[in-house]
Amino acid sequence: EEELQVIQPDKSVLVAAGETATLRCTATSLIPVGPIQWFRGAGPGRELIYNQKEGHFPRVTTVSDLTKRNNMDFSIRIGNITPADAGTYYCVKFRKGSPDDVEFKSGAGTELSVRAKPSAPVVSGPAARATPQHTVSFTCESHGFSPRDITLKWFKNGNELSDFQTNVDPVGESVSYSIHSTAKVVLTREDVHSQVICEVAHVTLQGDPLRGTANLSETIRVPPTLEVTQQPVRAENQVNVTCQVRKFYPQRLQLTWLENGNVSRTETASTVTENKDGTYNWMSWLLVNVSAHRDDVKLTCQVEHDGQPAVSKSHDLKVSAHPKEQGSNTAAENTGSNERNIY
């Protein structure tokens, strides 16, 4: 039993960020005379939150009218709570002293915990593109959440990934926390349309997790396959040679025709066809006048894809025999073709 007790009935209070926190406090007596003050923390570094005697505390309101006679309810409300408001709050009765007021009795304290939502997860991939069969790393970051407990999952096209590492910082007590996760993903040729998803679940999200995504189209490079073929003779002295560039991504591609090692023509892929898996096909052809050649001609289709070292495919065009095939349908009819006559 004591002359005056300061009662803080709530050991802890949990409030969502942006809401109002109510911190309850009652005194069992109004004697001795003196103000009630609220502090965050204890000891010499404690922070004054409210002083009944004087001061301006714009975020704080009293639950009851402290100017009312016999009022012993010293509860307060703190508006627009942020994670920085987390801590233990003490309701402290002071008594009039000479010359200064003297701390008389403190409540046991109420721990204010702030529930703050994590920020939208941001997923970032590697700086440079990588080719199928390679393993690439994706990072996911989310910040500003509290409490510390959080769940992070990775998915690729809806399938949960298992090869990832996650850290929540800081390790110790803090007003809010951040999560950082790195996942390893093995690329396949079919990943142009694939998505990597980072999913964050937290108590503040009420079962509706936040997601961050990265499109593998930003990460993957599928190198083309080349096929050079000689079409049936179009006319007595002309041969149509095509270079099929298949299954490449991204579209950025430059093709060069070489005749016996000499540059014949260079063109950039424009009118491409898209495959179901998101890769592209493109075809270029060359019309060769074989009558101008005494010797065999080595035709090379050289492709530089997405700034990578060139790949090439060659075809030996024999000039000694010109079998004539009537009525053949060739790609030379294509309006998008380019003709190159050799004399």
Partner: antibody
């Protein structure tokens, strides 16, 4: 139940120090303050001072230079010392609990005389 | 110091009648919404007994015939109806400012 009992010499010589003890029961001296009040014969009440539960003290400025209030919590006792007494210090001395003064001792009469 | 002046100095009342004692403070005894004024009854050879605290609150065990009112500097103790055993000295006391002070007392006699 709550009780307070004053004790001490009934006669003190002028210029000497008056020493009284208030023995309490039914409450803790760490939880409650104890006041000393005096009442000269046929006159009104005068507050001398208080010792709070935490051991801090507040005194009547008119007596401050001469008065000391202390306590021994383990013995449930509060002490009053008033130095350099004169005949004007002759009075019934009371101890009373806390700022509200809700419980009083019966009082002890102190006469200052040679 | 806050000086408390009680009036009247003495008062004779018949049983069943109302007795009113006033206490005027030289400065306000109000703080934080409350009046730190209390009333005590003292019978001869006895210590004072708390009747009313914080101007208007009846102490536990005290008959409801006693009531207190007032704020800031002017306070009243009312006994209604007066009974024979109410004959005593009555003191007001403030503990809003140091030093705590008592009024000079009012002697109530029963006719």
């Amino acid at each position: 139940q709550v009780q307070l009992q004053e004790s001490g010499p009934g006669l003190v010589k002028p210029s000497q120090t008056l020493s009284l003890t208030c023995t309490v029961s039914g409450f803790s001296l760490t939880g409650y303050g104890v006041n000393w009040i005096r009442q000269p014969p046929g006159k009104g009440l005068e507050w001398i001072g208080i010792i709070w539960g935490d051991g801090s003290t507040d005194y009547n400025s008119a007596l401050k230079s001469r008065v000391t209030i202390s306590k021994d919590t383990s013995k449930n006792q509060v002490f009053l010392k008033l130095s350099s007494v004169t005949a004007a210090d002759t009075a019934v001395y009371y101890c009373a609990r806390a700022g509200k003064m809700d419980y009083w001792g019966q009082g002890t009469t102190v006469t200052v005389s040679s | 110091d806050i000086v408390l002046t009680q009036s009247p100095a003495s008062l004779a009342v018949s049983p069943g009648q109302r007795a009113t004692i006033t206490c005027r403070a030289s400065e306000s005894v109000d703080s934080y919404g409350n009046s730190f004024m209390h009333w005590y009854q003292q019978k001869p050879g006895q210590p004072p007994k708390l009747l009313i605290y914080l101007a208007s609150n009846l102490e536990s065990g005290v008959p409801a015939r006693f009531s207190g009112s007032g704020s800031r500097t002017d306070f009243t103790l009312t006994i209604n109806p007066v009974e024979a055993n109410d004959a005593a000295n009555y003191y007001c006391q403030q503990n809003n400012e140091y030093p705590w002070t008592f009024g000079g007392g009012t002697k109530v006699e029963i006719k």
